[in-house]
Amino acid sequence: MAPWPELGDAQPNPSKYLEGATSQQPITPDKSKETNKTDNTEVPVTKFELLPTYSTATLIEEPTEVDDPWNLPTLQDSGIKWSERDAKGKILCVFQGIGRLILLLGFLYFFVCSLDVLSSAFQLVGGKMAGQFFSNSSIMSNPLLGLVIGVLVTVFVQSSSTSTSIVVSMVASSLLTVRAAIPIIMGANIGTSITNTIVALMQVGDRSEFRRAFAGATVHDFFNWLSVLVLLPVEVATHYLEVVTQLIVESFHFKNGEDAPDLLKVITKPFTKLIVQLDKKVISQIAMNDETAKNKSLVKIWCKTFTNMTQMNVTVPSMANCTSHSLCWTDGIQIWTMKNVTYKENIAKCQHIFVNFHLPDLAVGIILLIISLLVLCGCLIMIVKILGSVLKGQVATVIKKTINTDFPFPFAWLTGYLAILVGAGMTFIVQSSSVFTSALTPLIGIGVITIERAYPLTLGSNIGTTTTAILAALASPGNTLRSSLQIALCHFFFNISGILLWYPIPFTRLPIRMAKGLGNISAKYRWFAVFYLIIFFFLIPLTVFGLSLAGWPVLVGVGVPVVFIIILVLCLRLLQSRCPRVLPKKLQNWNFLPLCMHSLKPWDAVISKFTGPFQMPCCCCCRVCCRVCCLLCGCPKCCRCSKCCQDLEEGQEAQGVPVKAPETFDNITISREAQGEVRAPDSKTECTAL
């Protein structure tokens, strides 16, 4: 069947009315080799554009090749060429460029700061609960429980370094063995990839942008999940990570060295510590079954304290608790002994907003969560806008060619490995994989970086975060040096193993294909992105956690049938796409199942019903904000609302409600479901409140 014809513009100057229309056309010459390699698995998809109400639509000739939604957009340069500018114009242009750069760096700074505050907020909301996950004794015997605890704790505290440091202190104090700690570290690796997935959700306004951003973010998730899927059973069977790291740790005579360098933190800390400061030891203490820590607040009140070691008379249950008989005495009733007691004297209070409010941790956490998400969202929008205005025409071409083009033959294969090194290096500089991958996400969304290039950068980021951990381990005190180093090395070799599994051979780059698949679904049904986040990072881990607590028989009883069904579905799916003829007619497609079991359309209708009432106020709010935004920046159409809002306006127009026609439209991707019938997708199934 022929694809949808494109709608041309009868106006003499199309770009005058159709801003961003060109941005959706593929740049075939610039298309990277890697894109060619992997895209053959994708479903052909076509786009059409809705024009302003005053345009005349004319049919133009049908394109010979189908548009690929994964092609990078051409960012058209609408400005005057440099050579055509006068001296004043050139100076103005330079100042504009500098201004944009300063703004970009400023928003980037607040973006990173908001990620830090977001982590603090999550720790305040869920930190204590996360700490209690660790105090579960079943972790020792159940690697699956260890894995989900790693995921949940990292998701709740939004920081893999926090969960890793808890594990280190537990191993150092013999509450946990290295063997039991490895699955937790694997889980922490998965949990840390939620941050950039949340960041991707902020780009939900533009379908094509969201498709790329969400796929770019979830490529990290899929890499981690797939690595665990293969490497956890291997580790349980062979203990290779434990053995290899043990050999490395024992072969070196380490002296604890300098502290790991704080690079990005040097700039962000002065700001973030004015907002909130946390006493992260509290979570570790809860994890180590310290009852007193449960009543302590995570919000740091005293920043300058004086710790004095003094000998104090304390009561003990019996003479057996005395270090020596001569150091014990009685008051006639109780037995007393002399102990070295660390006495802490508070000298100066911290200088952050919440220091004198004495609010409960949950309240502070919720306040910071809302603020940091708003700042994160705002910064992201502004970063995308600034980048969008900077990366046009020639600049965009140069940048995209530099980032996405491979080395000349026969060294093309080296490009990806260089990207891994760049990712590792950049992560080492910013000291956080979350920050690096979150900064990468909007760049993927606006089409500066392809997913094929983002993938090795993300893998490098995984390596970079472990090198930071190794440095931190080498700087740790003697009593924790061995355990922290071994755990950091386990983390490092786990990521190396994952890369060896899912990167060297293009065929094995399964995370890219899976992320693209999820990107396509999420672009069409935007609620599915949130659904994915909840299921993969909360529901599945919590279910496994619950089943694990119930014991092995229950876990196996529920798990085996579920795994069997998943394998069955995957095998059937593979046969349907590769060799359907070997299957009976009924099994050649999923139509034998109820629609709700093989299509998201009915679910979309249900969700649209629920989200419908919220759509109108949301869109009104968006329009008001956009008007304000456009007034502030002085350009007539710098901001646009989501496609949902525009669909809503059209619906109202059809019912006779006069609404000002929107100025620009998103593209609509017609999926396989819609290709069967030549009609524009109805707003009910296409649009949700997301």
Partner: antibody, heavy 119, light 107 residues
Framework: QVQLQQPGAELVKPGASVKMSCKTS????????MHWVKQTPGQGLEWIGA????????AYNQKFKGKATLTADKSSSTAYMQLSSLTSEASAVYYC????????????WGQGTSVIVSS | DIVMTQSHKFMSRSVGDRVRITCKAS??????VAWYQQKPGQSPKLLIY???TRHSGVPDRFTGSGSGTDFIFTISNVQSEDLADYFC?????????FGAGTKLELK
């Protein structure tokens, strides 16, 4: 200043019981242990036991277990010792003494109650 | 029970003399030892605790020394008002025990 007041003498018949008091003032009654000490010319000073008025916890010398019962009344800041099934050996001077906080030295002593067991 | 042995029942000294009263514990009591003075017809009075620490209001002519099992109580410049019985007491473990006492007399 710290004061511990005890009645001067108690005359009791053999087999009977006696409950002697020790009224305190000048300090917080519930913060220090109250010890009871027996003094006889032949045996010297013997520790009977102690009570912590704060929670009523007691400790006894094995020799006096079952013979002496220590109690304390926080409202009147008074400590009591009851001696039961008295014999002539129980004839002695009984002191109440305040224990120093955190150890077993006794810093303030009552004047002592002289118990005479006689038929 | 820990037995506290005061080897001298009586000690005779002139005013201005120095007197050393000894006390031996049957086992190690660290420094959990107190010294008391009891004048005729009066209740005991605390002089020294923790083997060496003078109680408040006690003149500095009274000193204590020793640790473990051997303890010494010294009056460096005997005064007439110092005539009394002197007891040692251990509070290393229950039951608390006292020495039999040493009577200081004037020559």
């Amino acid at each position: 200043q710290v004061q511990l007041q005890q009645p001067g003498a108690e005359l009791v018949k053999p087999g009977a019981s006696v409950k002697m008091s020790c009224k305190t003032s000048g300090y917080t009654f519930t913060t220090n242990n109250m010890h009871w000490v027996k003094q006889t010319p032949g045996q010297g000073l013997e520790w009977i036991g102690a009570i912590y008025p704060g929670n009523g916890a007691t400790a006894y010398n094995q020799k006096f277990k079952g013979k002496a019962t220590l109690t304390a009344d926080k409202s009147s800041s008074t400590a009591y010792m009851q001696l039961s099934s008295l014999t002539s050996e129980a004839s002695a001077v009984y002191y109440c003494a305040r224990g120093m906080y955190g150890h077993g030295a006794m810093d303030y002593w009552g004047q002592g109650t002289s118990v005479i067991v006689s038929s | 029970d820990i037995v506290m042995t005061q080897s001298h029942k009586f000690m005779s000294r002139s005013v201005g003399d120095r007197v050393r009263i000894t006390c031996k514990a049957s086992q190690d009591v660290g420094t959990a030892v107190a010294w008391y003075q009891q004048k005729p017809g009066q209740s005991p009075k605390l002089l020294i605790y923790w083997a060496t620490t003078r109680h408040s209001g006690v003149p500095d002519r009274f000193t204590g020394s020793g640790s473990g099992t051997d303890f010494i109580f010294t009056i460096s410049n005997v005064q007439s008002e110092d005539l009394a019985d002197y007891f040692c007491q251990q509070y290393s473990s229950n039951p608390l025990t006292f020495g039999a006492g040493t009577k200081l007399e004037l020559k």
